[in-house]
């Protein structure tokens, strides 16, 4: 608890102080105080420097002073005998003493007295900046008119702050321009137009004068403008040295002018506005600004376009353009689209056909589709080379967007037929000499693949059964091959309307219109065993003349066996109608007259035995085409005939394209389209 | 019809071979698929091998590989399998069978041959 | 190989009975399934072809059904010529392989 004054004693005092003693007494007056220490008596063992036995005074970290030895006091009115005076109000003594004393020795006694110090003379450090006043325990700061004292209670300054300046346009001085600003101040002035605007300063050189900056070139004086976190400053010195125009770009500033106690000039002066806060006109690469303009400020709007070919991709919806707005913050809405070039993607897989990976899929680049030669091919023209265009789509320039269309190549055997020996007279045959041919296993017979989705067989054979089990691109029929090869399954039957249906289908002696179509559930894929015949085309090139050459194939019955087990085949003349008629019917089930002979059948045969036979029924009567010579088409059906060996009749499918075309054409699927 | 007449019984010892014959007649072998099937005593059927003529080779079941072969004679028109390094277990009746035709798997069986191996 | 697997091993019926045996595959044989039926001594007779297919001259009383893995032959009214052993066999590629056989015995 600090005290107004007290007394110190040695040990034992007025008695010898004891050896090896040391002791020290905290002295504390009350705050304002300095302390007054005086030692009315002092006899203590003398030493060099004190450094036996010793009263040491410690103010801080600072010795007073250190005793020893006899004093008397110097003035007989007083009994003094050593004095300090420390401005402080706190004071330690400490008392040392060592092992051996040569002599008695009494100590010391002293007393300390708090006195009044004068703060505003006995520091170096003035602690007003102003007017300075001493009372008894204390001290207070004053200050000149005009001037208030800050909350520090020390510093006096002049109320400059706390202005806002929210118009468009204004002047700021500073505290009596042009006359001496106030030393010792901090003045600030707030500067906030609406968001969208940013402040710009203007400033004359002439309407500056401020205290000069030391040698270290830092301003005693400054001015500082702050705007977020841009600042610009500190500026000081006779003459404006900043940029006379400042863009803040920034809707807020702060100005801060700080005075410290010295040199005082007339100050500054200046003018701000508001601008627009203007937009960097970007460069957006491959696009176009809608309107052009030199700058743009804020509310401005643009339509940014890309060029042909480029596109704003935005999640997943592309587009060609966007609007962007000049914003107040100076930065334009929607700066993070861009016009990229435009992606087709990945092009689209065609159905017996393939694409290359392309390089790239964007804008311009090109790629090429191919059909699985030699048994597809490009039905739709076009070349198959498509480019990516600026609409995102891969176009072709015959058929634009659409997709080329590989379709079946149709007549053209992987390998050419020879017979090796004189159906019934045949030869064996290879699958891919008839690519075509179809094989029925109830009842026995065959058909002609004409494209993926059709067959085209004789209506006799599917008239029984609607449901036929087929099946493509084996030489055999043996149930171990059948297995490997492809099973065909119907999806309907269409007879021709023309074919008379009988209760007792046994009896038939009109075959007339013996052609039917069988619609497959799934597309045949074709290869060197599968591949479809053509149909006969509609001119008179293809109406056939006596003695033109045709091919058949089939599992029919042979000289030896009732069912062949490997395709039997043999190559036929056209006969005339009545080469039919003349023969006897084998196993006639009416009377021979009733036998029906039409315009729609081909009469074929009588040549060294070679003939089809039955289980051969529905197969192709192939011949060459007369405008290609390296393509067959179906020229006829195995159909009926009187005898096995001698003549057979065919139906004549030229007679049927109109049928078998329209029907295709109602019953396809949008896969086919 | 195809008629298939197979050679007689045999007894064979551990370890011996054994060849059996199967005549085809009313067709050629070379329009036929020759396969071998056995069954032992009380057991069931188990397919031996075949030989395919549109591939020109002999397939022959996992278990069999190594220890038969299938042959054929076609002036004759006999086909033939040969079993190996017999054992117990091969005791059986083995028949020779046609393939069938348009999903028939088997269209005659041989009469059987029977061969027993015992020591 | 294709595993063929027949259930059940032993089936007791009487004459007039519906009777089911089903023959499942290892793996997908599309519709190449046969059933065939053996008689003591004799050789397998075959009955279904083709997983439906009646072979000509077997009574309409058996019937085939299924495709890829399961596959059932029906007898819809047993008769005394019908109590014997009954295989299935797959044909869909080499190695052909049979099922271990149900015998269908008098109850």
């Known amino acids: 608890e600090p005290t107004m004054y007290g007394e110190i004693l040695s040990p034992n005092y007025p008695q010898a102080y004891p050896s090896e003693v040391e002791k020290s007494w905290d002295i504390e007056v009350p705050e304002g105080y300095g302390i007054h220490l005086y030692f009315t008596h002092l006899d203590i063992e003398l030493s060099e420097n004190c450094a036996y036995d010793s009263v040491q005074i410690i103010s801080g970290d600072t010795e007073e002073g250190r005793l020893c030895g006899q004093r008397s006091s110097n003035n007989p009115h007083s009994p003094i005998v050593e004095e300090f005076q420390v401005p402080y109000n706190k004071l330690q003594v400490i008392f040392k003493s060592d092992f051996s004393n040569e002599e008695r020795f009494t100590g010391f006694a002293a007393y300390y007295v708090a006195t009044d110090i004068n703060e505003c003379t006995d520091f170096v450090d003035v602690p007003c900046s102003h007017f300075c006043n001493n009372f008894i325990g204390g001290y207070f700061c004053s200050c000149p008119p005009e001037y208030f004292l800050h909350d520090d209670m020390k510093n006096c300054g002049v109320n400059c702050s706390g202005d806002v300046f929210t118009a468009l346009i204004g002047e700021i001085a500073s505290p009596n321009y042009p006359k001496p600003y106030p030393e010792n101040s901090r003045c600030e002035y707030q500067i906030r137009l609406e968001k969208g605007f940013q402040v710009v300063v203007t400033l004359r050189r002439e309407d500056f004068d401020v205290e000069a900056a030391d040698s270290a070139g830092n301003c005693l004086d400054s001015l500082v403008f702050v705007a977020g976190d841009r600042q610009f400053g500190p500026y000081c010195g006779h003459g404006f040295p900043g940029p006379l125009n400042i863009e803040t770009k920034s809707n807020a500033l702060d100005i801060i002018f700080q005075t410290d106690l010295t040199g005082q000039k007339k100050g500054w002066k200046l003018r701000y506005h508001g601008d627009p806060m203007p937009c960097p006109k970007e460069d957006t690469p491959n696009s176009v600004w809608e309107p052009a303009k030199a700058k743009y400020v804020f509310r401005d709007v643009v339509q940014i376009t890309c060029l042909d070919g480029f596109e704003v991709v935005e999640g997943r919806v592309g587009a060609t353009s966007f609007y962007s707005t000049c914003q107040s913050n100076g930065k334009w809405s929607n700066s993070k689209l861009k016009c990229q070039p435009v992606d087709c993607g990945i092009p689209e897989s065609i159905e017996n056909g393939k694409v290359e990976d392309p390089e790239s899929t964007l804008f311009g680049s090109v790629i090429r589709y191919t059909c699985e030669e030699p048994y597809y091919y490009m039905e739709n023209g076009g070349g198959g080379e498509y480019h990516c265009a600026g609409n995102g789509s891969w176009v072709n320039e015959v058929l634009g967007p659409e997709l080329p269309k590989c379709v079946p190549v149709c007549g053209v055997p992987r390998e050419p037929f020879e017979e090796k020996q004189r159906i019934i007279g045949g030869s064996d045959a290879d699958i891919k000499n008839f690519p075509w041919q179809v094989f029925f296993d109830n009842p026995w017979a065959g058909g002609a693949l004409i494209n993926e989705y059709w067959v085209l067989t004789a209506a006799h054979v599917v008239e029984g059964n609607r449901e036929p089990t087929m099946y493509v691109g084996s030489t055999s029929v043996q149930t171990s091959r059948l297995a490997k090869s492809k099973m065909l399954t119907p999806e309907h039957v269409f007879i021709h309307p023309g074919w008379k249906l009988l209760e007792v289908p046994e009896g038939r002696t009109n075959f007339d219109n013996d052609i039917a179509l069988v619609r497959l559930k799934d597309p045949v894929k074709m290869g060197p065993t599968v591949s479809p015949i053509c149909l006969p085309g509609t001119s008179s090139d293809y109406n056939l003349m006596d003695g033109d050459l045709g091919l058949i194939s089939g599992w029919g019955r042979t000289e030896k066996r009732d069912r062949a087990v490997r395709l039997k085949a043999a190559r036929l003349p056209v006969a005339p109608l009545r080469k039919c008629k003349e023969v006897k019917v084998e196993k006639p089930t009416a009377d021979a007259e009733a036998y029906v002979f039409t315009p729609n059948m081909i009469c074929a045969g009588g040549e060294k035995g070679m003939d089809s036979c039955k289980g051969d029924s529905g197969g192709a009567f192939a011949v060459q085409d007369p405008n290609d010579k390296t393509k067959f088409y179906a020229a006829g059906l195995v159909s009926w005939g009187p005898q096995c060996g001698t003549y057979g009749l065919y139906t004549r499918v030229k007679n049927y394209v109109d049928w078998i075309m329209k029907t295709m054409q109602e019953n396809s699927t949008p896969r086919e389209d | 019809q195809v008629q298939l007449v197979q050679s007689g019984a045999e007894v064979k010892k551990p370890g011996a071979s054994v060849k059996v014959s199967c005549k085809v007649s009313?067709?050629?072998?070379?329009?036929?698929?020759m396969h071998w099937v056995r069954q032992a005593p009380g057991k069931g059927l188990e397919w031996m091998g075949t030989?395919?003529?549109?591939?020109?080779?002999?397939i022959y079941a996992q278990k069999f590989q190594g220890r038969v072969t299938m042959t054929e004679d076609t002036s004759t028109d006999t086909a033939y399998m040969e079993l190996s390094s017999l054992r117990s277990e091969d005791t059986a009746v083995y028949y020779c069978?046609?393939?069938?035709?348009?999903?028939?798997?088997?269209?005659?069986w041989g009469q059987g041959t029977l061969v027993t191996v015992s020591s | 190989d294709i595993q063929m697997t027949q259930s059940p091993s032993t089936l007791s019926a009487s004459v007039g009975d519906r009777v089911t045996i089903t023959c499942r595959a290892s793996?997908?044989?599309?519709?190449?399934l046969a059933w065939y039926q053996q008689k003591p001594g004799k050789a397998p007779k075959l009955l279904i072809y083709?997983?439906?297919s009646l072979e000509s001259g077997v009574p309409s009383r058996f019937s085939g059904s299924g495709s890829g893995t399961e596959f059932t032959l029906t007898i819809s009214s047993l008769q005394p010529d019908d109590f014997a052993t009954y295989y299935c066999?797959?044909?869909?590629?080499?190695?052909?392989?049979f099922g271990q056989g149900t015998k269908v015995e008098i109850k």
């Open positions: 069978v046609t393939e069938g035709l348009a999903g028939r798997p088997f269209d005659s």
């Open positions: 066999q797959q044909y869909n590629s080499y190695s052909w392989t």
């Open positions: 793996q997908s044989i599309s519709s190449w």
């Open positions: 009313g067709d050629t072998l070379t329009e036929l698929s």
């Open positions: 083709k997983a439906s």
């Open positions: 030989f395919d003529p549109e591939e020109g080779e002999t």
